[in-house]
Amino acid sequence: VTCDDYYYGFGCNKFCRPRDDFFGHYACDQNGNKTCMEGWMGPECNRAICRQGCSPKHGSCKLPGDCRCQYGWQGLYCD
């Protein structure tokens, strides 16, 4: 059985479209599961992995490796 584009698995009922945009950064494995690109995490691979050591409470990032501080916090790790 050959599945339609972006459909995977027995019965072709698993859907996965690789994407690299605002809504996700992932490839699809042979079973149609999302595999996050380097620097991204979460079920939709849309959460950037911040700079190692970046304060989870006072820092955040839109892009992998970043560490943007909340107002009132500073430093390489916003700590």
Epitope: D4, P43, R68
Partner: antibody, heavy 119, light 107 residues
């Protein structure tokens, strides 16, 4: 279970701004972007934009760029939609909405917030 | 931007009828299409995603088909609770636009 609870109805004057809140529960707030959709009385659905609560990244429909601001407060799992320079055509029900778990679109919706713009 | 054209805009039918609503995208959306049902005063409810997959707890009388730019929602045997407005929406790329809606009324 996933729940999205929105703030109450608003009556605004033309030229003013409105800020609608959407409190999320039942899932990890930073795992999924929050989208905003509006519906004018008797009209169809219109996608306005989305925010990634984890990092604050945003995507906006061209029509709303410069007039809408999406923000998120991770500490309270609350997303906000602020619309400025209001005009009568902005009278609508505003919904926050979230994708489902398997890449399908808007499976979860807030109850909607009616914003009325009138002088 | 991809535009979605939905037809018809309104439709009168009777309980037990088979009903078809179509949606045409201005570009290939590769099955990235959803269908919603909305009743007055309520938020939309997801019926079908990825063009043909039924969302949780949606009755099997609803089905979706299509590919490329042309998609169809079919209700095989209308029930009284099915009278509502139906919307298609693509989610291939932002902006995720909706069709104009189809109001399904009792004949």
């Amino acid at each position: 279970q996933v729940q999205l609870v929105q703030s109450g109805a608003e009556l605004k004057k033309p030229g003013s701004s409105v800020k609608v809140s959407c409190k999320a529960s039942g899932y990890t707030f930073t795992d999924y972007e929050m989208h905003w959709v509006r519906q004018a009385p008797g009209q169809g659905l219109e996608w306005m934009g989305a925010i990634q609560p984890g990092g604050g990244g945003t995507a906006y429909a061209q029509k709303f760029k410069g007039r809408v601001t999406l923000t998120a407060d991770k500490s309270t799992s609350t997303a906000y939609m602020e619309l400025s320079s209001l005009r009568s055509e902005d009278t609508a029900v505003y919904y926050c909405t979230r994708r489902g778990y398997d890449d399908y679109p808007f499976a979860y919706w807030g109850q909607g917030t009616l914003v009325t713009v009138s002088s | 931007d991809i535009q979605m054209t939905q037809s018809p805009s309104s439709l009168s039918a009777s309980v037990g009828d088979r009903v078809t609503i179509t949606c045409r995208a201005s570009g290939n959306i590769h099955n990235y299409l959803a269908w919603y049902q909305q009743k007055p005063g309520k938020a939309p409810k997801l019926l079908i995603y990825n063009a043909k997959t039924l969302a949780d707890a949606v009755p099997s009388r609803f089905s979706g088909s299509g590919s490329g730019t042309d998609y169809t929602l079919t209700i095989s045997s209308l029930q009284p609770e099915d009278f509502a407005t139906y919307y298609c929406q693509h989610f291939w790329s932002a902006p995720w636009t909706f069709g104009g809606g189809t109001k399904l009324e009792i004949k």
